[in-house]
């Protein structure tokens, strides 16, 4: 018995649901009662899932996965396998008995894109032409481990000075922390860059020094210019600072963190001490970076709703404030695709393709191709519908006359992540039918 | 190598047509589109068009539907672009070039070495 | 139709220098592409799906995104850099090229 999987691996992000695709060819007359069908984990053989005595026994592996049951008869023998972990990696076998026996290993690569870094710099005041600064970029929760590469601001990579660290967390997940050590010219950028080598999945941090003495007078508070980019359930840094006097005490200093349009209490710290989170609990300041002058504000858990603008006040004797923005993100999942009518398909027929790319954030761009790069931009609706989280999920369907054969692909763009994800569907001969079968 | 060799220069009358070649060597001419480009003396790059020599479909820029017709000839792997009803604005260099690449990414890796074409009174 | 706009047109620049070209597209594409043409040449590719160098194309080049605005940075211009730039897309029909950027030697 002929039993057909993915050559590739199936590349699942944690988090969201994976299919793996196993067919066989049922012959005239076969009923579901004559069928065996047993997933298991091909180095360990721990059962996973089977359907015998014509009945699906069931989920053995904590109760994630299940079976196309209305697709069995058709020799659609896949497996569902829900909101995957990092420990799903690896190799399951589909077995499949009839009269006759065959079985195929397919393989679960699993993926998790990395935040965009945040990055620090100490000493981050007075500093001179010169001096040698501590840089670190760190980048969150992703899967597999990433690769790290500095560059300076034209280009040329910055391979002297660096240490990388990467740490799994309990769900498997990769925090990596890069610190470039390096002596400040009279400016400078100094970008890192952390690769998904799996997802092909770039971030980018960067962060430009100017060497300069703080001018007298009002208390210049600095942020970034750019909005922080923050995913999704990832912890923020709102970066703000200030320079401090000699003679600095803490007991001088009053700070503010609050929503820059509805003026809303967000973190403070008074009268020498931390007064606490006022949003939701889910701030913090960095206390023992206080007195050298780093107001930054700690957001965890990000969520859309976070997205916005925050001002910090800094008032010691002067006072100052500057605004930062919050830039919330969620990449998109790689896009499932269908096709209906899915059977029998023969050049001339019309045929409905939908991509479905899910919980991404804000709203995607969407566009279709041929096989030879040609836009479909003709018969094609798009919708996209947020979550109870703002999370959105994007459908797109193209209404297409089948040609002989063609390649239909859908590209999902995150426009803050400048992520790209891809789906493809390929049709070929005459007649057939998709999924094709074994 | 892959190559896309174009036919030579041509003067033409006002109100005639020209038909340029452009013959492939080098991969498999049914694989990838053949588009038209041309540029005008001192001017920019101007689609005209494209065609699938393998279903033999085609699209054309709105500017030349009617005036330009592109065909491809799978047994001698060589694609044709006719313009007709010419006029002294047509005048420029014709290039034909392949629209390759994997999908979703794809862009003109080979270009003819281009056809003058003239139209003078 | 997908407008892409190249500015500046022309540019005066030496040797050694750090040029930016920008193109601005009217909507929001799928890729950008580049080419680069000499005079009484035809185009070569230069760089493909948005940030990509083609073949042979010296590490000087890259490109930044910012929503629709596509940027070509040559970091230390060298001899051979001077010619026209065009960027293009094919997201929509359409396809289009921007007008051209000409780098001449100041």
């Known amino acids: 018995l002929e039993v057909q999987v993915p050559e590739d691996p199936v590349v699942a992000l944690v988090g969201t649901d994976a299919t793996l695709r196993c067919s066989f060819s049922p012959e005239p007359g076969f009923s579901l009662a004559q069928l065996n069908l047993i997933w298991q984990l091909t180095d360990t053989k721990q059962l996973v899932h089977s359907f015998t005595e014509g009945r699906d026994q069931g989920s053995a592996y904590a109760n994630r996965t299940a079976l196309f049951l209305d697709l069995l008869a058709q020799g659609n023998a896949s497996l569902r396998l829900q909101r995957v972990r990092v420990a799903d990696e690896g190799s399951f076998t589909c077995f499949v008995s009839i009269r006759d026996f065959g079985s195929a290993a397919v393989s679960l690569q699993v993926a998790a894109p990395y935040s965009k870094p945040s990055m620090t710099l100490e000493p981050n005041k007075d500093l001179r032409p010169g001096d040698t600064v501590t840089i670190t970029c760190s980048s969150y929760r992703g899967y597999p481990e990433a690769e790290v590469f500095w560059q300076d601001g034209q280009g040329a990579p910055l391979t002297g000075n660096v240490t990388t660290s990467q740490m799994a967390n309990e769900q498997g997940l990769f925090d990596v922390h890069s610190v470039l050590r390096v002596v400040l010219g009279a400016n400078g950028t100094y970008s890192c860059l952390v690769r998904n080598p799996v997802l092909q999945q770039d971030a980018h941090g960067s962060i430009t020094i100017t060497p300069q003495r703080s001018p007298t007078g009002a208390v210049e508070v600095q942020v970034p210019e750019d909005p922080v980019v923050a995913l999704v359930g990832t912890d923020a840094t709102l970066r703000c600072s200030f320079s401090p006097e000699p003679g600095f005490s803490l007991a001088q200093l009053n700070l503010i963190w609050q929503l820059t349009d509805t003026k809303q209490l967000v973190h403070s710290f008074t009268e020498g001490r931390d007064q606490g989170s006022a949003y939701a609990n889910r701030t913090a300041l960095f206390l023992d970076l206080l007195a050298q002058g780093n107001a930054s504000l700690r957001l965890q858990r990000v969520r859309v709703a976070d997205e916005g603008s925050f001002t910090c006040f800094v008032s010691i004797r002067d006072f100052g404030s500057a605004a930062v923005s919050l830039q919330v993100a969620a990449p998109y999942s790689k896009p499932s695709m269908t096709l209906e009518p899915n059977k029998d398909l023969r050049p001339g027929d019309t045929v409905t393709i939908t991509c479905s790319s899910y919980r991404g954030y804000p709203e995607a761009e969407v566009f279709w191709q041929d096989g030879q790069g040609a836009p479909l931009t003709g018969n094609v609706t798009t919708s996209q519908m947020a979550n109870e989280q703002g999370l959105f999920d994007v459908h797109s369907v193209l209404r297409v006359v089948l040609g002989a054969n063609g390649t239909y692909s859908c590209l999902v763009r995150n426009p803050v992540l400048q992520q790209d994800a891809h789906g493809s569907v390929t049709i070929t001969g005459q007649p057939m039918t998709f999924p094709p079968e074994a | 190598e892959v190559q896309l060799v174009q036919s030579g220069a041509e003067v033409k009358k006002p109100g005639s047509s020209v038909k340029v070649s452009c013959k492939a060597s080098?991969?498999?001419?049914?694989?990838?589109?053949i588009h038209w480009v041309r540029q005008a003396p001192g001017q920019g790059l101007e689609w005209m068009g494209y065609?699938?020599?393998?279903?033999?479909?085609?699209d054309y820029a709105q500017k030349f539907q009617g005036r330009v017709t592109l065909t491809a000839d799978k047994s001698t792997s060589t694609a044709y672009m006719e313009l007709s009803s010419l006029r002294s604005e047509d005048t420029a260099v014709y290039y034909c070039?392949?629209?390759?690449?994997?999908?979703?990414?794809?862009?003109?890796?080979?270009w003819g070495q281009g056809t003058t074409v003239t139209v003078s009174s | 139709d997908i407008q892409l706009t190249q500015s500046p047109s022309f540019l005066s620049a030496s040797v050694g220098d750090r040029v930016t070209i920008t193109c601005r597209a009217s909507?929001?594409?799928?890729?950008m592409n580049w080419y680069q043409q000499k005079p009484g040449k035809s185009p070569k590719p230069w760089i493909y799906?948005?940030?990509n160098l083609a073949s042979g194309v010296p590490s000087r080049f890259s490109v930044s995104v910012s929503g629709t605005e596509h940027t070509l940075t040559i970091s230390s211009l060298q001899p051979e850099d001077f010619a026209t730039y065009y960027c293009?897309?094919?997201?929509?029909?359409?396809?289009?090229f921007g007008q051209g950027t000409k780098l001449e030697i100041k």
């Open positions: 070039a392949r629209y390759s690449g994997s999908t979703p990414y794809w862009y003109f890796d080979v």
């Open positions: 799906a948005t940030s």
């Open positions: 293009q897309q094919w997201s929509s029909n359409p396809l289009t």
């Open positions: 065609i699938n020599p393998n279903s033999r479909n085609t």
């Open positions: 909507s929001s594409v799928s890729y």
């Open positions: 080098g991969y498999s001419f049914t694989s990838y589109t």
